[in-house]
């Protein structure tokens, strides 16, 4: 019996508008009906929560209104989008999956996605 595996891409480049998207996929050891997905940022051995959402299997996952994350779910796959990123937000973003219900609870953690964010160059003043 293998432990729950969570897969996510190794590297993602954010768009010029500071938006990064990646897929977090997990192999479930049980028949979970309630799943919690958390995005955590790891920097200098400090881990901080970026956003979290709980969803019922078959339903959409919803983040809090003030969250910088949005996402959609399909089976054991979650498509995550993080918005409002700046160059200083470049770092390792870890997908954590918890099978919350029914018991038993299971924990799965991805290896992390290195998100690179490059601030756009300011537009030069036009001289017409």
């Amino acid at each position: 019996c293998k432990a729950m595996h969570v897969a996510q891409p190794a590297v993602v480049l954010a768009s010029s508008r500071g938006i990064a998207s990646f897929v977090c996929e997990y192999a479930s050891p049980g028949k979970a009906t309630e799943v919690r997905v958390t995005v955590l940022r790891q920097a200098d051995s400090q881990v901080t929560e970026v956003c979290a959402a709980t969803y019922m299997m078959g339903n959409e996952l919803t983040f809090l209104d003030d969250s910088i994350c949005t996402g959609t779910s399909s089976g054991n796959q979650v498509n995550l989008t993080i918005q409002g990123l700046r160059a200083m937000d470049t770092g390792l973003y870890i997908c954590k999956v918890e099978l919350m219900y029914p018991p038993p609870y299971y924990l799965g953690i991805g290896n992390g996605t290195q998100i690179y964010v490059i601030d756009p160059e300011p537009c030069p003043d036009s001289d017409f």
Epitope: C1, K2, A3, M4, E34, R36, L40, Q42, V47, T48, E49, A52, I94, K96, E98, M100, Y101, P103, P104, Y105, Y106, L107, I109
Partner: antibody, heavy 119, light 107 residues
Framework: QVQLVESGGGVVQPGRSLRLSCAAS????????MHWVRQAPGKGLEWVAV????????HYADSVKGRFTISRDNSKNTLYLQMNSLRAEDTAVYYC????????????WGQGTLVAVSS | DIQMTQSPSSLSASVGDRVTITCRAS??????LNWYQQKPGKAPKLLIY???SLQSGVPSRFSGSGSGTDFTLTISSLQPEDFATYYC?????????FGPGTKVDIK
């Protein structure tokens, strides 16, 4: 810094009830799973229960299922353990512990509170 | 439920000795394995988390290894303050079981 302080322990007769509290400070309480772990005199550590984040999901050890209820008040940063139908074998030091935000290890523990069930 | 076993249950060692404690899970727990040290009358103290990561402030003579079902805690050179009981614990699935403990005392 993270601080966990338990209270509510004492001597109680078999079949009676007791409620333990754990006051937390120094971190965003609602972002963490909170646990109770106990240790009977001269014995090893036994995980008792966990309550997750918003309090909607709880899991228990078989030895306390149906008798103990874990709860939390995120507005007060406080964790509780309601213990009903107490038995002699529930005699132990009860610790509250914070599960790590990433892998769930117990990096922070309370000092423990003793519950003695005796007639 | 995942059962955790530890060996030995107790050991006698001298200051400066290299000490190895093993922990085995009844099924794969990936790297969700933690090690704690406990002294009489005190709360447990985290030493190693995620099988091999050293907790901040813990001396480097402590190290952990393993994944899946087999794990090891090593104390490279036992110090007087290391005489205590050591527990492994899995944080992969409920119930979050502990091993029965290994008591390290003075030879």
């Amino acid at each position: 810094q993270v601080q966990l302080v338990e209270s509510g322990g004492g001597v109680v007769q078999p079949g009676r009830s007791l409620r333990l509290s754990c006051a937390a400070s120094g971190f965003t309480f609602s972002s963490y799973g909170m646990h109770w772990v106990r240790q009977a005199p001269g014995k090893g550590l036994e995980w008792v229960a966990v309550i997750w984040y918003d309090g909607n999901n709880k899991h228990y050890a078989d030895s306390v299922k149906g008798r103990f209820t874990i709860s939390r008040d995120n507005s007060k940063n406080t964790l509780y353990l309601q213990m009903n139908s107490l038995r002699a074998e529930d005699t132990a030091v009860y610790y509250c512990a914070r599960g790590d935000i990433l892998t769930g290890y117990y990096g922070s523990w309370g000092q423990g509170t003793l519950v003695a069930v005796s007639s | 439920d995942i059962q955790m076993t530890q060996s030995p249950s107790s050991l006698s060692a001298s200051v400066g000795d290299r000490v190895t404690i093993t922990c085995r899970a009844s099924q794969s727990i990936s790297s969700y394995l933690n090690w704690y040290q406990q002294k009489p009358g005190k709360a447990p103290k985290l030493l190693i988390y995620a099988a091999s990561s050293l907790q901040s402030g813990v001396p480097s003579r402590f190290s952990g290894s393993g994944s899946g079902t087999d794990f090891t805690l090593t104390i490279s050179s036992l110090q007087p303050e290391d005489f205590a009981t050591y527990y492994c614990q899995q944080s992969y699935s409920t119930p979050f079981t502990f091993g029965p403990g290994t008591k390290v005392d003075i030879k």
